[in-house]
Interface confidence: medium
């Protein structure tokens, strides 16, 4: 989060998170401004000359939807300024001279989570936005799965799922005969120290995906040849 001191007596704290594609969502904590004031944040690109994007605050939130040709890349950075009208004059204050979207990432949740049951295991697959495909190897997932009647707090978790959009759950991990639910979330992977700065992302987990329901496969017993063991 970034703090803008502004020109008024009270400081404001803005938190702006990006889905790393075309959207930046901002939230601010500040007392309401006076009646008739329509505050906004202005994102001015430090990389694309002339690139400015207005984020009109409604209550304590605003969203910028970038045009397709402005899809975010790691080198993007913006100057954020806060604008509001007071006594008929526009007041401007600096919020962040170098806002790096890649340092404030909250991805959209994975979509189209599906299950495919076959003997002895369940294959889960999911989709990511085409705009994130160049970053597939930088995406890290966490899976939660449980019996349908259980609360999510009781779910088992599997994490450190990096760079893939599929996963196998073996039958022994599930309770045979029960319907199970699984859900997934994603974040930018934390990479090794030798990664160039421009490839280094930080942020938080996405919201959880829509869950998928599936019947647990039967566990396979040991294969016994027809003539039996010696």
């Amino acid at each position: 989060s970034v703090t803008g001191e502004g020109q008024g007596p009270r400081s404001r704290t803005f938190t702006c998170l990006t889905n790393n594609i075309l959207r930046i969502d901002c939230h601010w904590s500040a007392p309401e401004l006076g009646q008739g004031s329509s505050p906004w944040l202005l994102f001015t690109s430090n990389q694309a000359p002339g690139g400015t994007h207005k984020c009109i605050l409604r209550g304590s939130e605003c969203t910028v939807v970038l045009p397709p040709e402005a899809v975010l890349v790691p080198s993007d950075n913006f100057t954020i300024t806060f604008h509001h009208c007071m006594s008929g004059r526009e007041q401007v204050s600096l919020v962040d001279p170098e806002y790096l979207p890649r340092r404030h990432v909250k991805l959209d949740p994975p979509s189209d989570l599906q299950s495919n049951i076959s003997s002895g295991h369940c294959i889960l697959t999911w989709s990511i936005s085409p705009a994130l495909e160049p970053m597939t190897t930088l995406l890290s997932y966490e899976l939660a799965f449980k019996k349908q009647e259980e609360a999510w707090e009781q779910a088992q978790h599997r994490d450190h799922i990096v760079g893939v959009t599929w996963l196998i759950l073996e039958a022994f991990e599930l309770d045979p005969g029960f319907i199970h639910e699984a859900r997934l979330r994603v974040q930018m992977a934390t990479l090794e120290d030798d990664v160039v700065e421009e490839e280094r992302y930080t942020g938080q987990w996405s919201e959880w995906s829509q869950p998928v329901c599936f019947q647990a496969p039967q566990r396979q017993g040991p294969l016994i040849p027809p003539w039996g063991w010696p």
């Epitope: 694309a48 000359p49 400015t52 045009p67 397709p68 040709e69 790691p74 993007d76």
Partner: nanobody, 125 residues
């Protein structure tokens, strides 16, 4: 970071054709508008052609319209300039450039952040 390397230049007779290529490194090529510029000896660098990030829009200088065609292959991280009906006045060093030009015009040089080293095109009469 985007690195650009041009190739395909050379010596050609008037009326002939050349195809320039510009290979880009980096996984974010798909997000950049691409342009070709040229600089003849003793002259300013000038805009030749440009193509939007997804190939949906193309732009040409009047002097090359109908003769040159710009295209891109995002899967190969490459932009091309097909030059037909070449004239001696097309002789120049041709530069490839990449930029986020969603607010300024694609013909403006300051729109472009990354530049290649250039490839020489010589058209003899």
């Amino acid at each position: 970071q985007v690195q650009l390397v041009e190739s395909g230049g050379g010596l050609v007779q008037a009326g002939g054709s050349l195809r320039l290529s510009c290979a880009a490194s980096g996984r974010y090529f798909y997000a950049y508008g691409m342009g070709w510029f040229r600089q003849a000896p003793g002259k300013e660098r000038e805009f030749v052609a440009a193509i939007s990030y997804n190939g949906g829009s193309t732009y040409y200088a009047d002097s090359v319209k109908g003769r040159f065609t710009i295209s891109r292959d995002n899967a190969k991280n490459t932009v091309y300039l097909q030059m037909n009906s070449l004239k001696p006045e097309d002789t120049a060093v041709y530069y490839c450039a990449a930029g986020r030009w969603y607010k300024l015009g694609p013909s403006e040089q300051r729109t472009y952040r990354y530049w290649g080293q250039g490839t020489q095109v010589t058209v003899s009469s």
